[in-house]
């Protein structure tokens, strides 16, 4: 999906108002310095591409993030403010359902959500030069 035509300011507002709080809740008990940010993004469409991938695509050691509250609200925001987004997700979700495991908060998942927090922070500051 091409995130170029999304309403970035509304997605940012939804992130600041509620999605960010859900990410913090997920990470509660974890030190903010515990994980290094290794995933980056260069502009807002790119950030959303990376956010979508980390949130909804199962990875080795962490197959469960798509069922978390922050993921549900992220999906809602992208569907509402990115034209045509919900129509593009059908095949991806169908494939994911077959692989999805029961919800377990592993260290790998915590690391992945830490990366997500970094991507969202970058999304919120699009004018900053890439480090």
């Amino acid at each position: 999906y091409d995130f170029t035509n999304c309403d970035f300011e509304k997605i940012k507002a939804a992130y600041l108002s509620t999605i960010s709080k859900d990410l913090i809740t997920y990470m509660s008990g974890t030190k903010s310095t515990e994980f290094n940010n290794t995933v980056s993004c260069s502009n807002r469409p790119h950030c959303l591409t990376e956010i979508q991938s980390l949130t909804f695509n199962p990875t080795a050691g962490c197959a469960s993030l798509a069922k978390e509250m922050f993921a549900m609200k992220t999906k809602a925001a992208l569907a509402i403010w990115c034209p045509g987004y919900s129509e593009t997700q059908i095949n991806a979700t169908q494939a994911m359902k077959k692989r999805r495991k029961r919800k377990v908060t592993t260290n790998k998942c915590l690391e992945q959500v830490s990366q997500l927090q970094g991507l969202w922070r970058r999304f919120n500051r699009p004018l900053l030069k890439q480090q």
Epitope: A14, K21, I24, K67, A76, A79, I90, Q94
Partner: antibody
């Protein structure tokens, strides 16, 4: 304007199933989570589950242990909630409620009128 | 699951008086995830307050919401006849979504 119109009242026998519909209009049906909430007579509200019509993803309240199935038909902008193995305690008003961002806070912003399901032998 | 406990179950108040409704949450949640709904007999619930303190569209300013963590409050500064109803708090912090048992505000 957003509207959620539910199917009519049902009377069912214990052990049978019921399927309640919720027809949505006035918004992009595929892009919003749809929730189902029930209310037994004189009781509070109980969340049953939700569906994202765009891709069919669902989340359920484990209390219903597989008795509830939520589906959606994008072609008719209709969500369905089916409850099986009915017992008398399932007698309730069943509501559909859209999940949406209001002032960028996420909540159930529009509700159907409710469908009364009576389970009686 | 997060348990929502509302108190009192019934509140008897005279028109013009102040009413304070409490919602206690079993584990700490973000204020953005706590909502209030109003329900009158024979009607569907209506969104009333979003995210602890943001009034839904058309809700009069005599209503206010506050709180954080595990304790939240809905306050009606001067009760009007149309305010007599049941009020439910609800959390959208973790699954399953849960509601409080409701507080019925009735005429004294």
């Amino acid at each position: 304007q957003v509207q959620l119109v539910q199917s009519g009242a049902e009377v069912k026998k214990p052990g049978s199933s019921v399927k309640v519909s919720c027809k949505a209009s006035g918004y992009a049906f595929s892009s919003y989570w749809m929730n189902w909430v029930r209310q037994a007579p004189g009781q509070g509200l109980e969340w049953m589950g939700q569906i994202f019509p765009g891709d069919g993803e669902t989340n359920y309240n484990g209390k219903f242990k597989g008795r509830v199935t939520i589906t959606a038909d994008k072609s008719t902008s209709t969500a369905y909630m089916e409850l099986s193995s009915l017992r008398s305690e399932d007698t309730a008003v069943y509501y559909c409620a859209r999940g949406g961002y209001v002032n960028f806070l996420y909540a159930m912003d529009y509700w159907g009128q409710g469908t009364t399901v009576t389970v009686s032998s | 699951e997060i348990v929502m406990t509302q108190s009192p179950a019934t509140l008897s108040v005279s028109p013009g008086e102040r009413a304070t409704l409490s919602c206690s949450v079993s584990s700490s949640i973000s204020s953005s995830n706590l909502h209030w709904y109003q329900q009158k007999p024979g009607q569907s619930p209506r969104p009333w307050i979003y995210g602890t303190s943001t009034l839904a569209s058309g809700i009069p300013a005599r209503f206010s919401g506050s709180g954080s963590g595990t304790e939240f409050t809905l306050t009606i500064s001067s009760l009007q006849s149309e305010d007599f109803a049941v009020y439910y708090c609800q959390q959208w912090s973790s699954y399953p979504l849960t509601f409080g048992g409701g507080t019925k505000v009735e005429i004294k």
